[in-house]
Interface confidence: low
């Protein structure tokens, strides 16, 4: 069946619409479009003959219609009057007609709506406002948006029956709600600009800032008053009840304490006609100067004077505080504060008081602290000390004594030696001292402020250093069992102790060893060969000790009875005879051999080769010590045999004088002595 479709069905004014014929038969001769619901030649828009491709406009053609060979009708730039029905008449080649009717509607493009209000300045929580969506247009739907949300259900919002008017009740001051209206028809949707309500309110109680913090003299006072108000409030300032100015800010440069007082701000709303006031108290304090401390006594005497410290200057509305060694003042029996804390009294001040005192002044705008003050406490002098202490001094050294007494002010010093004034210095210096400088040294300390004196005495001893001692002897070569030896420790020294060592051992006194002359002389009675020493002497006093070099005694002794070796008495004929003689003696003895009474030789060894029986006889060894003047001898009888016989030994000794053998020996000794001196 032949039908007509409108594309689109609802057409916006000024746009175009296309009418399409559907189910058109084949083998068409042509077709004709009419305005309206029926075929009416007077309302023909145009026709189309397919075979000749001829399109002919009709009386209803406005110049905006275009007919196409596919049986479509395009109408451009449509107007409201184009709304309605359109009919197509299709003529087949058999000249049988077919008809169909279609339609469309034309709607205007809506303008952007806007909102009008019956009251632009409602008063909070009092006035209602009617908002109307303009313009009024036909076939239009009206919608409202509140804060970009669709209209909520609220007792404060009411719509008119056509939705074009929205009434808002009880509007609060902080209502920043945005209202928009929307218009709709089938071809357009438009939304207005947002509207917010200018709610009149206030003034509220004004606030003054900054708040009543203390102010410093010399600053400026700049107070700002603010009251929530619409329209903006007008402001009026009153100081202590007197009108000052009608500005939001009150500015007073370089304020003084006279600017303290009651500051009132009045806020006025010209629309609501209301007034509200707020009062603040302003206190102006002078900036405190740096304080300083004065004292009634700059030089107190220890444990005696009290000192009163005062914090200056005295200023109004000021709190005074004291600091002792950087610590807030604590309660003490030695410290006393005045009622206003401005004066601090210090009692019983000890000498070592290095306490520093500071005072602090405070008011609400400033805190200042003084420079520290310490007290100069007078004391002393204490008993002076002399240094170094009274150690003994060696003659030839320098004596340098220093005196010190704790004292403030510093003490003056005076030196006395053995009661005689020497000098007024802290140090006493004597170069190259002698024993004459020994004595009593007194230092006197004087404090010029307290007027006191104190003294101290020290004893100085000067000693001479001992020399190194040496030993002298009355006999360097004593003879054993005959001589006594006297050893003397030199030199003689006063106040000196003498000591002796024998064989590196302290001397043990015995009947043969005697000390005399204050131990300076050591006597050895009847020396023996074991008394050689070494001997040392030492001298000492309280300051030093010295020891001599060792000395040994050359004790002469002997000769002791000689010994002939070997001990054999019998020899074979033809053997060698080799006899050796030895005697203990100092100095070494002289040896002589006598055979059968005849002197043979002056040697310690007697040698005879290839002995025979002729060598039988008495062999005598004679020893002589020229230092002791003593001699000794021994005789050995030797037998020479041709046969074997057991050897034997026999010896005869002789010493001293009076025997024939000794007479011979004496004669030989003289001869020997004479021989050795030529």
């Amino acid at each position: 069946q032949l039908t007509i479709e409108s594309r689109p069905f609802n057409v916006a004014e000024g746009k175009e619409v296309l009418l399409l014929a559907h189910n058109v038969s084949q083998n068409l001769f042509g077709y004709i479009w009419y305005k309206g619901e029926r075929v009416d030649a007077s309302r023909r828009i145009g026709s189309c003959v397919i075979r000749t491709q001829q399109i002919t406009p009709g009386p209803a053609h406005s110049g905006r219609e275009t007919i196409d060979f596919n049986a479509s009708l395009l109408i451009q730039n449509v107007t409201q009057s184009d709304t309605g029905s359109y009919t197509i008449q299709v003529i087949k080649e058999d000249l049988v007609n077919e008809e169909a009717t279609g339609q469309f509607r034309v709607y205007p493009e809506l303008p952007k709506p806007y909102i009008t209000s019956n009251n632009s300045n409602p008063i909070e929580d009092k006035d209602a406002v009617a908002l109307t969506c303009e313009p009024e247009t036909q076939d239009t739907t009206y919608l409202w948006w509140v804060n970009n949300q669709s209209l909520p259900v609220s007792p404060r919002l009411e719509l008119s029956s056509d939705n074009r008017t929205l009434t808002v009740f009880n509007i609060p001051r902080n209502d920043t709600t945005s209202y928009k209206c929307e218009t709709q028809n089938p071809v357009s949707v438009r939304r207005s600009d947002p509207v917010t309500l200018n709610v009149l309110y206030g003034p509220d109680a004004p606030t003054i800032s900054p708040l009543n913090t203390p102010y410093r003299a010399g600053e400026y006072l700049n107070l700002t008053c603010h009251a929530a108000s619409n329209p903006t409030a007008q402001y009026f300032w009153f100081v202590n009840g007197t009108f000052q100015q009608s500005t939001q800010e009150l500015f007073i440069p370089n304020i003084t304490v006279n600017n303290s007082g009651s500051y009132m701000c009045q806020a006025h709303n010209s629309a609501t006609g209301l007034n509200r006031t707020t009062v603040t108290a302003i206190t102006v304090y002078a900036e405190l100067p740096k304080p300083y401390i004065t004292s009634n006594n700059s030089n107190p005497i220890e444990d005696k004077d009290a000192v009163t410290l005062t914090c200056e200057p005295e200023t109004q509305d000021t709190t005074y505080l004291w600091w002792v060694n950087n610590q807030r003042l604590s309660v003490s029996s030695r410290l006393e504060l005045s009622n206003d804390n401005r004066t601090l009294t210090v009692f019983n001040i000890p000498r070592n008081d290095t306490t520093f005192y500071e005072c602090e002044t405070q008011n609400p705008v400033s805190v200042r602290r003084s420079d520290p003050v310490t007290l100069n406490v007078l004391y002393g002098p204490d008993a002076p000390t002399i240094s170094p202490l009274n150690t003994p001094y060696r003659a030839g050294e320098n004596l340098n004594l220093s005196c010190h007494a704790a004292s403030n002010p510093a003490a003056q010093y005076f030196w006395f030696v053995n009661g005689t004034f020497q000098q007024s210095t802290q140090e006493l210096f004597i170069p190259n001292i002698t024993v004459n400088n020994s004595g009593s040294y007194m230092c006197q300390a004087h404090n010029s402020a307290t007027g006191l004196n104190r003294t101290t005495v020290t004893a100085i001893t000067v000693y001479v250093e001992l020399p190194k001692p040496y030993i002298s002897s009355n006999n360097s070569n004593p003879i054993e069992d005959k001589d006594a030896v006297t050893l003397t420790c030199e030199p003689v020294a006063e106040n000196t102790t003498y000591l002796w060592w024998v064989n590196n051992q302290s001397l043990s006194v015995s009947p043969r060893l005697q000390l005399s002359n204050g131990n300076r002389i050591l006597t050895l009675l009847s020396v023996t060969r074991n008394d050689t020493g070494p001997y040392e002497c030492g001298i000492q006093n309280s300051e030093s000790a010295k020891r001599s070099d060792p000395v040994t005694l050359n004790v002469t002794y002997g000769p002791d009875t000689p010994i002939i070796s070997p001990p054999d008495l019998s020899y074979r004929s033809g053997a060698n005879l080799n006899l050796s003689c030895h005697s203990d003696s100092n100095p070494s003895p002289q040896y002589s051999w006598l055979i059968n009474g005849t002197l043979r030789q002056h040697t310690q060894v007697l040698f005879i080769s290839k002995i025979t029986s002729n060598n039988n006889g008495a062999y005598a060894c004679f020893v002589s010590n020229l230092a002791t003047g003593r001699n000794n001898s021994i005789v050995k009888n030797i037998s020479v045999s041709s046969g074997d016989s057991a050897p034997g030994s026999s010896g005869l000794s002789a010493s001293g004088s009076g025997s024939g053998l000794n007479d011979i020996f004496e004669a030989q000794k003289i001869e020997w002595h004479h021989h050795h001196h030529h």
């Epitope: 913090t213 107070l223 705008v365």
Partner: antibody, heavy 120, light 107 residues
């Protein structure tokens, strides 16, 4: 909008020196008393120093006296803190603060802070 | 120097509860006391000064009281945004000193 922005905080060795700056905007800087306040790693708040609006009056606690110096350049809207002879106990976040207009009392406005670390 | 002693050092509470933080001055500071709130990683913010005056924008559930040496900060009906650290500070002349802080945590 009143704004305080601190800068200059770094790691510094004990005994060293450092200068912090605070740039102010959005208010009449030359009319406000200013202070530096620091917050230690243990979260304790300590007032460091104060300067009045004209720059003629300064205060310091004993802990920093003689080592720190506060100054301001009202033409440049900038507050400074010169720190010397730094000690490990000076490690903290340093805040630039403005007092209420005409007041030297509470710290009404604070910057975001700058970290100073004193360590060998 | 004036010492400020704050208690408790820490406090756990639930949303909706009421809490009180106290601060004691070592000497009379009249009404020269401020309270600050500090949230994690942020700068301290002034809540109250002159002992009881609320800074502009601070909710009315906060209130300060006291004078002389004893002060307190009360928070009614705790909200989630109230958790953090609170410090008291005297502004009665230099040196200004702070309390050691109270950490308010969610229970």
């Amino acid at each position: 909008e009143l704004q305080l922005v601190e800068s200059g905080g770094v790691l510094v060795k004990p005994g060293g020196s450092l200068k912090l700056s605070c740039a102010a905007s959005g208010f009449a800087f030359s009319s406000y008393d200013m202070s530096w306040v620091r917050q230690t790693p243990e979260k304790r708040l300590e007032w460091v120093t104060y300067i009045n609006s004209g720059g003629g009056i300064t205060y310091y606690p004993d802990t920093v006296k003689g080592r720190f110096t506060i100054s301001r350049d009202n033409a440049r809207n900038t507050l400074y803190l010169q720190m010397s002879s730094l000690k490990s106990e000076d490690t903290a976040i340093y805040y630039c603060t403005a007092h209420y207009f005409g007041s030297s009392g509470p710290f009404a406005y604070w910057g975001q802070g700058t970290l100073v670390t004193v360590s060998a | 120097d004036i010492q400020m002693t704050q208690s408790p050092a820490s406090l756990s509470a639930s949303v909706g509860e009421t809490v009180t933080i106290t601060c004691r001055a070592s000497e009379n500071i009249y009404s020269y006391l401020a309270w600050y709130q500090q949230k994690q990683g942020k700068s301290p913010q002034l809540l109250v000064y002159n002992a009881k005056t609320l800074t502009e924008g601070v909710p009315s559930r906060f209130s300060g009281s006291g004078s002389g040496t004893q002060f307190s900060l009360k928070i009614n009906s705790l909200q989630p945004e109230d958790f953090g650290s609170y410090y008291c500070q005297h502004h009665y002349g230099t040196p200004f000193t702070f309390g050691s802080g109270t950490k308010l945590e969610i229970k």
